[in-house]
Interface confidence: low
């Protein structure tokens, strides 16, 4: 049988000589040199030679445990004369020995980790981890501790698990940003001869809010003229803030101050800038300054720094309003005059005033604006505003006359402002009443007298206070032996009655009967007109059969002896 | 929405006249001026003038004043401007256009119609 | 009537550069001045009014300012659909009137 143990090599073997493995031996090896050794397997023959009589083995190369740990061989011992095995072939292993020939490697070179500023002490930044080649079930050459090098007292690590963690209270990244820390990892559990490698970590502290916003200035100044519109920016306002990103956002607003009500700020989220705005209209003659007091505070605000204070800070603004030449302004915002229509030429209606409201309070002069009165019916007197007529007014042509009247400023021509006047024409009775229509009637030849054979209707032009009262009546030269008669209905309308028992065609065969129509008013106005009554030919109902065409187509002969 | 339409062409004879319209929808039509804007080839913008639909008052550049002659219907919620005695000079793009918000801009316009004038 | 003098007449600009346009008003027009863009062939496109407010959905590129009788408009960063030409508007008196117009052409 074979007679041997396992094999044992320590690694890294620096002798000049082969390094001695050990020894094959069969005890039915009598020392003659009968027998002969073959080596197999891993090496064999290579790294591992073995001396055929008295098989001893020998490594011919500096082995590494990292590289290989273990190298399986197989073993023969035969008769040299017989070249028959006297043993079995048996397998066997050769276990290379470590020694601490590696140091630990770090997973990365350089780390890169951040961490909030002012974080508490013992907060985790990262965890390096290193690794050693050597053995780690024999001693302690695989055994790693972790050490800071550099970056106290800023950071610690744990020696055991390589976690680094914030070792100094209120870390402040407005102060410093960046932080460089070397880490040891030692094998040999950290013993003095033990192997190191180290890593750099870059640390940022990442930012919080922890600084209020604050304005460089504790005043600003901005001047704007009267005339900007709501929404005209007049100045721009910027807090700074130490932090960054959303913790240095800034929200402007206007807090106090007799400009509460007349002037806005908004936040320009691009610059951060606060941007004063008008709000209302502004006028230099009522009020020239006024004061704001604007706000500047973090929207979004961390509890657990309000022990620093509050998250604002404030500023005065002042803003000087600049006087702008503005155009006059008239007392009312519309004039309404009368008039009575037969006014003469150059009657005074009424006046408009305006005023400059500047404190230069420059003096104005009036014009009616033409387009507005093209016709030139009215005039105005340039330095009182006195609205005069200059022609003649008829209210039964155009009842209301709407014209402009300008005001201008005698010093600067381009301000100037415009009114309405609406100018009411009041009726004076100048126009007599008339018939509503033409009328043309007829009489039955057998009538009886006090027949009613037609009802006349008048119309005047005028429009009295009191409405129309209209009176008819035959004329006096048709009056007396009239074959008809007028009856005033006292209605504004009257009848034309039958005044005898028939009527002869052949005799008389047209009427003329001259009305008089006169109106109630003063002066009483009045007017004659004709009616024609043609005498006919009738059935026993009353309707007409036949008249002389004649009596229109050949007026003159009539007779008016009506 | 807001819209303001306007023919695509108009082809007159010099010394003729021409009514161009703008029908306006989408908004109260009385309730804002109604301006008229030319633009002759490959030049600028020019102010011609505006109309008030409610009432018909108009305000125009003394430069246009005996060329255009603007006008409503406010049943049909038209503009229209007419020009006339057109020569070739008057070949342009006219454009209607309404100040909708709350300042004096032209925040809204018609795709303009364009006028050539030749015999 | 106010006379606007628009400059440059004309310029060209490369993608990602920034003009700037400007209006002198021959007198004080007080804030009341509005910027145009005017593509080829369409009608004008209100950009900015009250010489530095932007009208809804106009990009942020295009930023007004001015007082008095001075008046510009910048355009960041250029992009290629800024092809256009811009004109300025005063309407503090009458009659309105317009710049000359700038043509902006992308290289």
């Known amino acids: 049988s074979w007679m041997w143990n396992q094999f044992f090599l320590l690694e890294e073997y620096t002798g000049s000589d082969y390094q001695y493995v050990g020894k094959l031996h069969s005890d039915q090896d009598r020392g003659d040199g009968s027998l002969k050794y073959i080596l197999s397997g891993d090496g064999a023959g290579d790294l591992f030679i073995i001396n055929e009589n008295t098989g001893d083995i020998q490594a011919t190369k500096r082995l590494d445990r990292e590289e290989k740990p273990v190298y399986i061989l197989r073993a023969q011992a035969i008769n040299r004369r017989t070249g028959r095995p006297v043993e079995p072939e048996s397998e066997f292993i050769i276990k290379i020995h470590d020694i601490n020939d590696n140091e630990p490697i770090f997973t990365k070179e350089v780390y890169t980790a951040t961490v909030p500023e002012m974080s508490d002490v013992g907060t985790f930044v990262v965890q390096v981890t290193a690794t050693d080649a050597d053995d780690p079930t024999y001693g302690n050459s695989a055994k790693v501790v972790y050490s800071i090098l550099q970056g106290q007292p800023y950071f610690s690590v744990e020696s055991e698990t390589g976690i680094i963690k914030t070792a100094l209270l209120n870390m402040d990244r407005e102060n410093r940003e960046q932080y460089q820390v070397v880490i040891q990892a030692k094998d040999m559990g950290g013993q003095m001869g033990g192997l190191s490698g180290t890593t750099t970590v870059n640390i940022t502290l990442t930012d919080v809010n922890d600084n209020p916003p604050r304005f460089p200035q504790s005043t600003y100044q901005f001047k704007t003229p009267e005339s900007s519109p709501p929404g005209t920016p007049i100045g721009r306002i910027k807090a700074s803030d130490a932090d960054v990103g959303e913790n240095a956002e800034i929200e402007y607003s206007i807090t106090d101050g007799e400009g509460l009500d007349m002037f806005d700020v908004i936040t320009d989220q691009e610059t951060q800038e606060g941007i004063i705005t008008v709000k209302k209209l502004l006028d230099f003659e009522k009020k020239k300054v006024y004061t704001l007091k604007v706000e500047a505070s973090n929207p979004y605000v961390e509890p657990r720094f309000l022990y620093l204070g509050p998250f604002k800070d404030s500023a005065t603004v002042r803003i000087v309003v600049e006087d702008v030449d503005e155009p006059p302004v008239f007392s009312k915002l519309a004039y309404i005059l009368q008039i009575r229509e037969d006014a003469q030429i150059n009657t005074t209606i009424g006046s408009v005033t305006a005023q400059d409201p500047d404190a230069a309070r420059n003096p104005v002069k009036y014009s009616v604006d033409r387009h507005t009165d093209m016709d030139r019916i009215f005039n105005i007197d340039s330095g009182n505003g006195s609205i005069f007529t200059s022609k003649l007014l008829d209210r039964e042509t155009l009842l209301w006359h709407n014209i402009t009247v300008i005001a201008t400023e005698i010093n600067n021509p381009k301000q100037s402002s415009r009114v309405p006047l609406y100018i009411k024409v009041l009726d004076v009775n100048d126009n007599a009443p008339e018939f509503a229509e033409f009328y043309e009637t007829f009489v039955c030849e057998k009538a009886k007298a006090d027949q009613l054979i037609q009802t006349l209707h008048a119309v005047d032009k005028d429009d009295p206070y009191s409405g129309h009262q209209f009176s008819f009546s035959l004329a006096p030269e048709a009056a007396s032996g009239s074959n008809f008669t007028i009856q005033d209905n006292k209605d504004n309308t009257a009848g034309i009655l039958t005044r005898k028992n028939g009527y002869n065609r052949h005799e008389m065969s047209t009427y003329l009967l001259p009305v008089v129509i006169s109106d109630n008013d003063y002066p009483v106005q009045s007017s004659t007109g004709t009616v024609t009554v043609r005498v006919c030919a009738c059935d026993h109902h009353g309707n007409m059969q036949s008249c002389h065409a004649e009596a229109l187509i050949h007026p003159t002969g009539l007779s008016t002896g009506a | 929405q807001v819209q303001l339409q306007q023919p695509g062409a108009e082809l007159v004879k010099p010394g003729a006249s021409v009514k161009l319209s703008c029908k306006a929808s989408?908004?109260?039509?009385?309730?804002?001026?109604m301006h008229w804007v030319r633009q002759r080839p490959g030049q600028g913008l020019e102010w011609i003038g505006e109309i008030n639909p409610n009432n018909g008052g108009t305000n125009c550049n003394e430069q246009f004043k005996n060329k255009a002659t603007l006008t409503v219907d406010k049943s049909s919620s038209t503009a229209y401007m007419q020009l006339s005695s057109l020569t070739s000079e008057d070949s342009a793009v006219f454009y209607c256009t309404i100040s909708f918000g709350n300042y004096l801009f032209f925040d809204v316009w018609g795709a303009g119609t364009t006028v050539t004038v030749s015999s | 009537d106010i006379q606007m003098t628009q400059s440059p007449a004309s310029l060209a600009a490369s993608v990602g550069e920034t003009i700037t346009i400007t209006c002198q008003a021959s007198?004080?027009?007080?804030?009341?001045l509005a910027w145009y863009q005017q593509k080829q062939g369409k009608s004008p496109q209100l950009l900015i009014y009250n010489a530095n407010t932007l009208e809804d959905g106009v990009p942020s590129r295009f930023v007004g300012s001015g007082s008095g009788t001075q008046y510009s408009m910048k355009i960041n960063s250029i992009q290629p659909e800024d092809t256009a030409t811009y004109f300025c508007?005063?309407?503090?008196?009458?009659?309105?009137?317009f710049g000359g117009g700038t043509k902006l052409e992308i290289k």
């Open positions: 989408g908004y109260t039509f009385t309730g804002y001026w």
């Open positions: 508007d005063q309407t503090y008196d009458f009659p309105w009137t």
């Open positions: 007198e004080n027009i007080y804030f009341s």
